[in-house]
């Protein structure tokens, strides 16, 4: 069965700066990938960016980099001032679009005793919802 | 819950120009659907797909208005545009948005998946 996996660093060298770290464990081609906040896009959740493997990243503030890091993860550094920042409880999350497999999505947060730079290993989350 | 608020309707001569817009909004978050589009219905017709454009800019437009209309969103990607010139009387229908998401990120042929709908907008093209 595929998994999403979803991992939540808060930068030592900016306090309220965040990477979000995401991947997919299946055998099936990536469509798309879609990273939101407070919620799954669209249920509550605001798309902070999607990347589509050849059609390009959209990315709306405040992700300030969006990339792909392998063909089936990717990471998002979110600048962290203003209204919009996020902060220590902030749930933030993935959703890849497969072929053949269909849609997976999976959230994370900041691990509450986590210090600036360090995170949780990036362990498979619990799947929201398969489509 | 997301709602879709057409505005820009009216009343213009045949050869004239219209811009329709359509914000979506949502209570608590933002919604940037994948694909936002437009559709029609003339009096007494079925609905007609009018143009799409998806989160990546790529667009599609009905062969009737291809050359005429010009479909737009803004970066913010909640907001839908649609530029009208040239209007003939046969464009004179209830101007509606439609919005959703969809695998790939494209829009769906013939508006399968986009599950939000606006209220429309009335456009008539009479001298």
């Known amino acids: 069965t595929p998994e999403v996996w979803v991992q939540v660093r808060m930068e030592a060298t900016e306090l309220s700066s965040f990477t979000i770290r995401c991947g997919f464990l299946g055998s099936g081609s990536i469509s798309l990938v879609t990273v939101s906040w407070g919620g799954p896009n669209g249920a509550g959740g605001t798309t902070l960016a999607v990347l589509h493997p050849e059609r390009g990243i959209r990315q709306w503030a405040p992700a300030r980099q969006a990339r792909w890091e392998t063909q089936s993860s990717i990471s998002l550094i979110l600048e962290g001032s203003g209204a919009s920042s996020p902060c220590a409880n902030t749930t933030f999350c993935c959703k890849f679009a497969s072929f053949p497999e269909g849609s997976w999505e999976a959230c994370g947060s900041l691990p509450p005793s986590s210090d600036p730079g360090l995170s949780a290993p990036p362990t498979p989350a619990p799947i929201l919802r398969a489509d | 819950e997301v709602q879709l608020v057409e505005s820009g309707g009216g009343l213009v001569q045949p050869g004239g120009s219209l811009r329709l817009s359509c914000v979506a909004s949502a209570s608590g978050f933002t919604y940037r659907p994948y694909c936002m589009a437009w559709f029609r219905q003339a009096p007494g017709k079925g609905l007609e797909a009018v143009a799409g454009i998806d989160i990546f800019g790529g667009t599609t437009y009905a062969d009737s208005v291809k050359g005429r209309f010009t479909i737009s969103r803004d970066n913010a990607g909640f907001s839908l545009y649609l530029q009208m010139n040239s209007l003939r009387a046969e464009d004179t229908a209830v101007y509606y948005c439609?919005?959703?998401?969809?695998?790939?990120?494209?829009?769906?042929?013939?508006?399968?998946?986009?599950?939000?709908w606006g209220q429309g907008t009335m456009v008539t093209v009479s001298s």
């Open positions: 439609a919005a959703g998401d969809s695998p790939d990120g494209r829009c769906p042929p013939l508006g399968q998946g986009l599950n939000y």
